[in-house]
């Protein structure tokens, strides 16, 4: 019950995360111009990662579009990037998630396959999340930079008359609505990979059953040879046959792919 | 045909208060940014006041703050200007006109006067 | 507050001529964003409200006839008349829309001779 609620909760999660990741891309309001001396402005500049739009007082609001893709700024492609592989592998983890709910079945498939999926949807989301994290962080950083060097531009070169007012841009909407998407996602993928640790069919919790050769002992261990899912602890397929009889409890268990969470 | 119709002007005693009405038809007045301007007897142009399309937001300049109010009802298709702390150097004609593309005023009504003189 | 300045204060021409009057800002109208001036010109003539000619510096608004043409940038803006009617007799204004307080020019009287 835990182990659904946690993967249900993870998928939900993550759904909105990547709905947040998805509205921060398309927003215009990355960077937005800084009112630092001028709260009452009739012109009001914002930009986004696709177009850069001006507001007039009158209410008026021309938007125009990057029409060039060599032309801009590397950090800016950079930014475009990382937003886009993090709605691509939020999309493909969420489709894989839903297949991967224990409330949903579909088929005769099994719980080892359902925690494989949930596992691999669990690392997109917290690659996803990870992807917007860096990208709103870069273009912060971008801004950060260039509101110090146009703030510095701003104080030289007054001694004439008519001066020149330059904008200075700071963070918009998009960039928090970014950072709080990416990590609702990244805790999502984290909440899919800890319940994908409870979705793992566990081995029988039997006790070896001891049969005492006259020669020598040799320990019958329920499951040995398992089918090679990749799941359960005996992963490696490896013989549980040594030299004297143990107990369940005592054998060496091997780091299952699920163990890195 | 766009039209904006001011009313309301007169003569006042200074320290006196007066309110201009804009009646305002033709046009989806709820969708304008509105302004009042005023010309002085020398002939020179002042904005006066600014009042955002859905009642959010108003701006004055300095020399009209605290004692002019700009306010509008949408349902009557109206603007107001409330003058309070009258002062000679408010005698001038009062505009009202509509904000259009680039801050422009693209409709200017007609005027009313506005006499402050003891 | 940008203080626009008008030059010359009256122009006395003759019909069909053409007129060119200046307008100065004290700060630059030009808007990074858009790449556009906010600078307005106004035509007022006798007894009658102002009329709206010209925005963002250059664009002329409907109606206006194409005699009428606005240029410039940054501080430095001009107001043309290619060949002058005896309707053009009026007062001619700039105004700064780029920030608040919204500012005007004194003027530009246009007599014909």
């Known amino acids: 019950m835990a182990v659904t609620a946690c993967q249900g909760l993870g998928f939900v999660v993550s759904l909105i995360g990547i709905a947040g990741i998805i509205a921060a891309t398309c927003m215009d309001q990355w960077s937005t111009q800084d009112l630092y001396n001028n709260p009452v402005t009739a012109v009001f500049n914002y930009q986004g990662l696709w177009r850069s739009c001006v507001r007039e007082s009158s209410g008026f609001t021309e938007c125009r579009g990057y029409f060039t893709l060599l032309g801009l700024p590397a950090m800016l492609q950079a930014v475009r990037a990382l937003m886009i592989v993090g709605i691509v592998l939020g999309a493909i983890g969420l489709l894989v998630s839903i297949f991967a709910l224990k409330c949903i079945r579909i088929g005769s498939m099994e719980d080892s396959a359902k925690a494989n999926m949930t596992l691999t949807s669990g690392i997109m989301f917290i690659v996803s999340g990870l992807c917007a994290i860096a990208g709103v962080s870069v273009f912060a950083n971008m801004l950060v930079t260039n509101f110090w060097m146009s703030t510095a531009n701003m104080y030289t070169g007054m001694g004439g008359m008519v001066q020149t007012v330059q904008t200075r841009y700071t963070f918009g909407a998009a960039l928090f609505v970014g950072w709080v998407a990416g990590g609702l996602t990244l805790i999502g993928g984290v909440m899919m990979c800890i319940a994908c640790r409870g979705l793992a069919p566990e081995e029988t919790n039997y006790k070896a059953v001891s049969y005492h050769a006259s020669g020598h002992s040799v320990a019958y261990k329920p499951g040995g040879f398992k089918a090679s899912t990749g799941f359960g602890s005996n992963t490696k397929n490896k013989k549980i046959y040594d030299g004297g009889a143990r107990t369940e409890d005592e054998v060496q268990s091997y780091p299952s792919k699920h163990d890195y969470v | 045909e766009v039209m904006l119709v001011e009313s309301g002007g007169g003569l006042v005693k200074p320290g006196g208060s007066l309110k201009l009405s804009c009646a305002a038809s033709?046009?989806?007045?709820?969708?304008?940014?509105m302004c009042w301007v005023r010309q002085t007897p020398e002939k020179r142009l002042e904005w006066v006041a600014t009042i955002s399309s859905g009642n959010f937001y108003t701006y004055y300049p300095d020399s009209v703050k605290g004692r002019f109010t700009i306010s509008r009802d949408n349902a009557k298709n109206t603007l107001y200007l409330q003058m309070s702390s009258l002062r000679s150097e408010d005698t001038a004609i009062y505009y009202c006109a509509s904000l259009g593309r680039g801050n422009a005023l693209d409709n200017w009504g007609q005027g009313t006067s506005v006499t402050v003189s003891s | 507050d940008i203080v626009m300045t008008q030059s010359p204060a009256s122009l006395t021409v003759t019909a069909k001529e053409k007129v060119t009057m200046s307008c100065r800002s004290s700060q630059s109208l030009l808007n990074s964003g858009n790449q556009k001036n906010y600078l307005t010109w106004y035509q007022q003539k006798p007894g009658q409200p102002p009329k709206l000619l010209i925005y963002?510096?250059?664009t002329r608004e409907s109606g206006v006839p194409d005699r009428f043409t606005g240029s410039g940038s940054g501080t430095d803006f001009t107001l043309t008349i290619s060949s002058v009617q005896a309707e053009d007799l009026a007062v001619y204004y700039c105004q700064n829309d780029y920030s608040y307080p919204f500012t005007f020019g004194s003027g530009t009287k246009l007599e014909i001779k």
């Open positions: 033709g046009f989806t007045f709820n969708n304008y940014v």
């Open positions: 963002w510096a250059s």
